[in-house]
């Protein structure tokens, strides 16, 4: 029985050449995080290990780092960073819980966050 | 190249017990998730343990709970599985599986091997 | 436990034939569905995961599509080292369960 939520940063902006965090949160459930995966639109970029700790996908070493916590953060953001990110938890005995995360890189010097929202 | 060859299976009587190992190589054990499924003759497969890279998470199917433990011996890249009380149902041949470092899918498996438990 | 279904439980099919085999899941998997495939007296060997991510190494004429209940695995093409027993797992919930079996035969 799954009956945890996950609650996520949402729909985040941010400015080109900067840095973001990308950060999920696994509640109302007593279920074991085995792991925490983070993708990009299909492409893994990091995972959280419960026993091994972080492992980052080569191709993204320059620009992604682990943490703060669970989370990911992104540097060195372009335009072509833009889209859907998810955080999947891989959990016992529960089993598998997504978040996703949209992202939007500006040109522009004005970046807001958007509002927190959650997906049972 | 990945190898898994399993050994310990054979012929034991119910209540008794067995031990399987899983002789690993070509990949970094300890950085991958691991597991044992079952099939019995002529049927599906099954899934029956989960262990963490580190050892330090166990899963089990609730068929097993309680009678098979699963273990790891990093620095022998090798992986058990104890199992005792077994039952004539047990029968099957067991397969050790490493799932891929996303563990989104078990990626490679070894040939198996039998155990049956008979009077 | 979440139940997974597959149809038919057996097909016969020439080589050349597409052929679609459908894994249909009792809840919601999302995407967590894989596929495997096993020869007599052998292992089950990765073809799919994540319902339509295909394994390295693993023939272009496979492919997987679907999500939430519903998937389906196909061959474009058959060729004779298909022919074979094809499984479907579900990774959504403990425990991981698979669906009965697809076996494939020459006709």
């Known amino acids: 029985m799954m009956t945890g939520t996950i609650e996520t940063t949402g729909n985040i902006s941010a400015e080109k050449g900067g840095s973001i965090i990308l950060q999920c949160h696994l509640s109302s459930t007593t279920a074991q995080v085995t792991q925490v995966n983070w993708e990009q639109q299909d492409q893994l970029l990091a995972i959280c290990n419960a026993d091994l700790g972080w492992h980052i996908s080569p191709s993204f070493k320059d620009r992604v780092a682990p943490g703060p916590g669970l989370g990911l953060t992104l540097q060195s953001l372009t335009v072509n960073d833009t889209g859907e990110y998810f955080c999947i938890y891989h959990t016992y005995p529960d089993g598998t819980y997504t978040g996703r995360i949209f992202l939007e890189v500006l040109e522009s010097s004005v970046a807001e966050h958007g509002a927190r929202f959650q997906i049972p | 190249e990945v190898q898994l060859v399993e050994s310990g299976g054979g012929l034991v009587q119910p209540g008794g017990s067995l031990r399987l190992s899983c002789a690993a190589s070509g990949f970094t054990f300890s950085s991958y998730i691991m597991s044992w499924v079952r099939q019995a003759p002529g049927k599906g497969l099954e899934w029956v343990s989960t262990i963490s890279g580190g050892g330090t998470n166990t899963y089990y199917a609730d068929s097993v709970k309680g009678r098979f433990t699963i273990s790891r011996d990093n620095s022998k890249n090798t992986l058990y599985l104890q199992m005792n009380s077994l039952r004539a149902e047990d029968t099957a041949v067991y397969y050790c599986?490493?799932?891929?470092?996303?563990?989104?899918?078990?990626?490679?498996w070894g040939q198996g091997t039998l155990v049956t438990v008979s009077s | 436990d979440i139940q997974m279904t597959q149809s038919p439980s057996s097909l016969s099919a020439s080589v050349g034939d597409r052929i679609t085999i459908t894994c249909r899941a009792s809840q919601n998997i999302n995407v967590w569905l894989t596929w495997y495939q096993q020869k007599p007296g052998k292992a089950p060997k990765l073809l799919i995961y994540?319902?339509?991510k295909s394994h390295t190494g693993v023939p272009s004429r496979f492919s997987g599509s679907g999500s939430g209940t519903d998937f389906t695995l196909t061959i474009s093409s058959l060729q004779p080292e298909d022919f074979a027993t094809y499984y479907c797992?579900?990774?959504?919930?403990?425990?991981?369960?698979f669906g009965q079996g697809t076996k494939l035969e020459i006709k």
């Open positions: 797992q579900q990774g959504q919930s403990y425990p991981y369960t």
């Open positions: 994540k319902a339509s």
């Open positions: 599986a490493k799932w891929l470092l996303s563990y989104y899918a078990m990626d490679y």
